[in-house]
Structures are given as C-alpha cells and as structure tokens.
Amino acid sequence: DAEFRHDSGYEVHHQKLVFFAEDVGSNKGAIIGLMVGGVV
C-alpha cells in the first residue's frame, strides 16, 4: 500500500490512483454538510 495523506477510499481519477474519503480532521470540507474551520 502506498501511503497518502488521505486515508481511505481509492478512486481512479484521470488515470491516477487517489484517496477519496478523508480524515474528519481535514479542514477542506470533505464531508458533505459538516461545519469545518471557524465558520459560524
């Protein structure tokens, strides 16, 4: 297994293997509808 920053969910995207599901600690809003960062 190659190790990437994102820790789950492989997806072939533009012929490149990338991780899809991201850690809940991600600050990018990978989880649909989950409030992230300091936004109020």
């Epitope: 899809f20 599901a21 850690d23």
Partner: antibody
Amino acid sequence: QVQLVQSGAEVKEPGASVKVSCKGSGFNIKTYYVHWLRQLPEKGLEWIGRIDPENGETIYTPKFQDKATLTVDTSTDTAYMELSSLRSEDTAVYYCVSSGYWGQGTLVTVSS
Amino acid sequence: DIVMTQSPLSNPVTPGEPASISCRSSKSLLHRNGKTYLYWYLQKPGQSPQLLIYQMDNLASGVPDRFSSSGSGTDFTLKISRVEAEDVGVYYCAQNLELWTFGQGTKVEIK
C-alpha cells in the same frame, strides 16, 4: 447571515445546456470544497462531484463525468455547475454544499 | 458502486416513542484505520438536507442527543430515543468510502 444562494429555476429543452450558480454570502467560498448533489423528483440524493476552489481540482461520480462541469470564480465567491446534453432524466433539484452550508436548491426542468 | 439499502421506506412514529431506521451497505465501510465511513442526513419537508451523524457515530453540531447511530461494517441503525414533531422528514444513510452514494431514504411521519 452566512448562506449559499443558488440561481433560480430553469426550464430547458432536451439537448441544451444549463449553468447553475452558487454564491457565498458572508462566506469565503475559496476555503472549502464545494459539493454538488441532485435530487430527482420524489427520489433520493445523488452526489455529482466536488471542486476544490483553491486549485480548481475536481472529482466527479463517473456517470456525471461527461455531463457536469464544475468551476469556481473566487473573485465573486461563486461556484458553478454546467450540465450539458440535457435529457428529461436530468430534471431534478440541484444543490451546492460547502462546509456546513447548503444552497436552497435549483430546480432544472428538461422538457420539450 | 457501493449500494446503500434502507428499511423501512416509510416509518410512522408516535411522538415521545423511540424509533429506528436500518441501513445496509453492499461492502464494509469499516476501513483499516478504524473509521467507519457511514453518514446520516435528514431532509425536513421543504428544506435542504442536513447532516445528522458523521463517520457512523459522531453527532454533527447542533444535532440533539436523542439521535444516535451504531453498527458494524455493513449494518447500521439510526435511533431516535424520543421522537419529536420536528423530526419528521426523509432520512438518508450515505457512504464516502468510495465517492458518495446514498440510500433511497426513509420517510418518517407522525402517526
């Protein structure tokens, strides 16, 4: 008030294209991924894809790879989803989502 | 695609009583990192959906603690300890182990 405001309902003929906008109000849209989903009439939710406004990187569900194009204009805090080659089966309410905020939904009706 | 299957599709409930919704995935959502990539959303009538539960058992901000979720790798349950009138709507389970897919929805209505 922080919110995502989507453009209004659209009626299109089969084969046409439509571009739906999603503007961040009191919200810096470039900070977080923008997800797009759709809800077919009386049906469940389908994830179309997402865009990272920081670098324009996109990921699509395979069935939408040739149907949807996601873009962001960071200068106006607006995300866009363009749908091409519309068919009656594309009639749905389309939602944008970023962080904990959802747009109100845009009804796209495809009818001749 | 990972297929998410919910039951029942309709669930008439009595206010003050408990209620539960089941969801099954066609593939285990438990990753080797110990996280389970299962989510619950609620769409109230006339509203956009909202996130209730993320990564199987974490309550989203502002969600009342009468909601809870549990499960294994493929079988999951959303429980409402005491249903309130404001809980009516369509509940969806979803996964993002591989992209995002949603269940067909369970409509919860007051008896």
